[in-house]
């Protein structure tokens, strides 16, 4: 969470940004809020990126002004016009690229004053893992698969019954490059599993942490997955 103040004469407005992460190939949001102003046509929103000449996006007089937009962002940005009324200047970024990572500035000017705040935007790939019982294996085993990760994550297994146990000796993890030659498919197999136990497959890089849980009993298999972005404001 980054709060910035701006001064215009005697007036300053608070602008707040949140560090966030973009999943490459998907759409992302760079979050920014400001003190709402009743005079709507006086609101100017500018998004800038460190090291880039020109603007990422500009919104003024109630509409987008893309005359100074840098070509790397052409056709990929939008603000939520209706949300500007309530002080939301967040930027929608379509088809996130690895090169979109960096420091962005959300600059706001209203009839009350001006202000800005920076945010760090991380880009990578992250996806939910799915755990299945691998019946093909010679012994009972679990297979944890996640289709898209970047940078290369670490994978660890845990068990409810054997808490604190190190499963690295009884698991095998592989990373397979996907067709776009950036992201990778993560596959990890855990051998010698026992029934009536809950196992967790944890995949983590510097952007996200994902966990898949599976509980295997005589009568059923229960699964649960969750994904958490790291260092998000």
């Amino acid at each position: 969470l980054i709060i910035g103040f701006g001064i215009s004469g005697k007036h300053f407005i608070t602008v707040t940004t949140f560090t966030s992460a973009g999943n490459i190939g998907e759409d992302g949001t760079l979050s920014c809020t400001f003190e709402p102003d009743i005079k709507l046509n006086g609101i100017v929103i500018q998004w800038l990126k460190e090291g880039i000449k020109g603007l990422v996006h500009e919104f003024k007089e109630g509409k987008d002004d893309l005359s100074q937009q840098h070509e790397m962002f052409r056709g990929r940005t939008a603000v939520f016009a209706d949300q500007v009324v309530v002080g939301n200047a967040s930027l929608r970024l379509k088809n996130v690229q690895l090169t979109d990572a960096g420091t962005y500035t959300c600059y706001i000017r209203t009839s009350k004053g001006k202000g800005n705040a920076n945010l760090e935007y991380k880009t990578g790939a992250f996806s939910m893992p799915e755990i299945n019982v691998d019946y093909n294996a010679s012994s009972e085993s679990l297979r944890c698969e996640a289709p898209r990760w970047f940078p290369q994550p670490t994978v660890a297994w845990a068990s409810q019954v054997d808490q604190g146990a190190n499963f690295s000796e009884v698991s095998n993890t592989s990373f397979e490059l996907n067709s776009e030659n950036v992201t990778m498919k993560v596959v990890s197999v855990l051998y010698n599993v026992t029934i009536n136990n809950t196992y967790s497959c944890m995949i983590e890089n510097d952007i996200a942490k994902a966990t898949g849980d599976i509980k295997v009993t005589d009568s059923e298999v229960k699964r649960r997955s969750q994904l958490q972005l790291l260092n998000s404001g």
Epitope: I38, L40, N41, D82, V85, V86
Partner: antibody
């Protein structure tokens, strides 16, 4: 000085429609949103809908979805609110107001009575 | 949809005394909160926006405070013209929701 002047009181039959106007003067009409807020007798304030001429968009409260239509005529600085399929519970004073996000100037109110 | 609640429903205070009116939001509205005063037969009047910023022409005996979900409007020394209904309103999200109001009456 900003002024919002609304049309006069109306008596309507259940099932019919009402249309209230709100003429703004004293500031740039399209610089601001115009909202409609109603107040039933002895009750509190209820935001119904808002129009943002500069954005060309409108928002309705879910409760009035499909029944309320708001429009704005920039050339005459006038906003309109139409409410259809009126019922007795729609009897209220209807205010036009400048805003959101908050509301700094209000019209004098238009009393609409729905009665058979 | 954000739900706004106000307490008390009615507050009886003597002129010259201090009055504190409470407003609560069902989820955080940050600082996107306004207060209005309404006298019988009149349109509401904006008192405060942004939690604590007084609107043009509002006397400094009216003070707003709070953040997130809990807010208070304090009138430091009540004048006879201050009696009436008071409403809070959130503008963090559409739709804009008013609280049910607090009626401030003369004791």
């Amino acid at each position: 000085q900003v002024q919002l002047v609304q049309s006069g009181a109306e008596v309507k039959k259940p099932g019919s429609s009402m249309k209230v106007s709100c003429k703004a003067s004293g500031d740039t009409f399209s610089s601001y949103a115009i909202s409609w807020v109603r107040q039933a007798p002895g009750q509190g304030l209820e935001w119904m809908a808002g129009i943002i001429p500069v954005f060309g968009t409108a928002h309705n409260a879910q409760k009035f979805q499909g029944r309320v239509t708001i429009t704005a005529d920039k050339s005459t600085s006038t906003a309109y609110m139409e409410l259809s399929s009126l019922r007795s519970e729609d009897t209220a004073v209807y205010y036009c107001t400048r805003g959101g996000p908050y509301f700094d100037y209000w019209g004098q109110g238009t009393l609409v009575t729905v009665s058979s | 949809e954000i739900v706004m609640t106000q307490s008390p429903a009615t507050l009886s205070v003597s002129p010259g005394e201090r009055a504190a009116l409470s407003c609560r939001a069902s989820q955080s509205v940050s600082s996107n909160l306004a207060w209005y005063q309404q006298k019988p037969g009149q349109a509401p009047r904006l008192l405060i926006y942004g939690v604590s910023t007084r609107a043009t022409g509002i006397p400094d005996r009216f003070n707003g405070s709070g953040s997130g979900t809990e807010f208070t409007l304090t009138i430091s020394s009540l004048q006879s013209e201050d009696f009436g209904a008071y409403y809070c309103q959130q503008y963090k999200k559409w739709p804009f929701i008013f609280g049910p109001g607090t009626k401030l009456e003369i004791k």
